[in-house]
């Protein structure tokens, strides 16, 4: 299963549900289906209030039963560890895959934590994080922000991912905007044509 690198804002905007939750144990295979489910304990919902209607929480996260079907494998044994889970809502259930944005909450930068709670949503449906994985690359639209972490940092974890969101500057223009949490190193150009 090959997964394209994803900026956290893209993960947030493309998901039906974004929650904080703890994994409560080993997965349970669901007979006669290609799926298994993890019992989870949701601690906070960050996105999906409209989608879930009256549902008050999710007890399970469903994923394909095999890694070869892009199934998610939860490796942590720590039941008290809180994870950010960005998934899809399918038939009223939380659905995740090996490519889902799913990370320990404490592994997110303070700026990312803040953005998942309130900032990323402002860019959804308006702005697009456009990955630049090879030079040359250029912006295709004023609503795009060029994401250069993979080139500059050699990884999808970089300054833009950790500290910036692609947000509307005015109705026709989106730009990288600093999320306002202190940083220890200098910044690359926030929006540039590589």
């Amino acid at each position: 299963c090959s997964c394209a690198p994803t900026h956290p804002q893209t993960a947030f905007c493309n998901s039906d549900l974004v929650i904080r939750a703890k994994f409560m144990g080993s997965p349970e295979i669901i007979e006669t289906t290609l799926y298994q489910r993890y019992e989870i304990k949701m601690t906070k919902m960050l996105k999906g209030f409209d989608a879930v209607g009256n549902a008050t929480g999710f007890r399970f996260a469903y994923t394909p039963a095999m890694e070869s079907l892009c199934g998610y494998v939860h490796k942590s044994q720590n039941r008290s560890e809180e994870f950010l889970i960005a998934g899809r809502l399918r038939n009223g259930n939380l659905h995740i895959t090996a490519c889902s944005f799913l990370v320990p909450w404490h592994n997110l930068s303070p700026a990312q934590q803040k953005a998942f709670v309130k900032t990323y949503s402002a860019g959804c449906g308006v702005c697009t994080v456009f990955p630049c994985s090879a030079i040359p690359c250029k912006l295709e639209s004023d609503s795009h922000c060029l994401w250069t972490d993979q080139i500059l940092m050699g990884s999808e974890k970089g300054y833009q991912s950790d500290h910036f969101a692609c947000l509307p500057r005015n109705p026709d223009l989106c730009t990288w905007q600093y999320l306002g949490v202190s940083m220890t190193r200098s910044l690359p150009l926030a929006k540039a044509e590589a």
Partner: antibody, heavy 120, light 108 residues
Framework: QVQLVQSGAEVKKPGESLKISCKGS????????IGWVRQMPGKGLEWMGI????????RYSPSFQGQVTISADKSISTAYLQWSSLKASDTAMYYC?????????????WGQGTLVTVSS | DIALTQPASVSGSPGQSITISCTGT?????????VSWYQQHPGKAPKLMIY???NRPSGVSNRFSGSKSGNTASLTISGLQAEDEADYYC????????FGGGTKLTVL
Amino acid sequence: QVQLVQSGAEVKKPGESLKISCKGSGYSFTSYWIGWVRQMPGKGLEWMGIIYPGDSDTRYSPSFQGQVTISADKSISTAYLQWSSLKASDTAMYYCARLFTYPFLYFDVWGQGTLVTVSS
Amino acid sequence: DIALTQPASVSGSPGQSITISCTGTSSDVGGYNYVSWYQQHPGKAPKLMIYDVSNRPSGVSNRFSGSKSGNTASLTISGLQAEDEADYYCQSDFPVMVFGGGTKLTVL
């Protein structure tokens, strides 16, 4: 290009055995699941089961569990669907298809189909 | 039983737009219906037209588009052409792998 080529049409009698094949080319055969789909005359599509040629892991639809056997020979990039004792109700077109697995499971490449006719 | 319900038939004239619906049985609140769509001409194998609700594989005309609203997914064909006459099937994999019953599209 990516393609799946199936074996030719078969005419059999009830009670006989049969094994039809599906040969993949143009991609890494061991890295994708292969599914089998039945289409009875004038009817819709029914998923029968899937196999991962890399390790021969197999999953069946409950409706077809115990009725057919799905196997694969990765050395010749071929998947198989077989019956040990055919019935008249097995008369149908059978398709193999490559299963794409992200973000959801769907069939992106299909074989041309094998028509199986079971009649006394 | 899990099922996807499609209209048995739909028709339209050349140049028109038509929509084929695919409704899941789930009564769950917020039960989004993520499906793929296939086209099958008589005597031919099915062909993938739309995956993950609204994505088109390369080579598929942009006259074909997909959408979802709650528990119903839809396939829309704009600028209907004679060669669009075929059977169309929706398919979901969750919680079980299942195809809709199929819709026969007739171009008048």
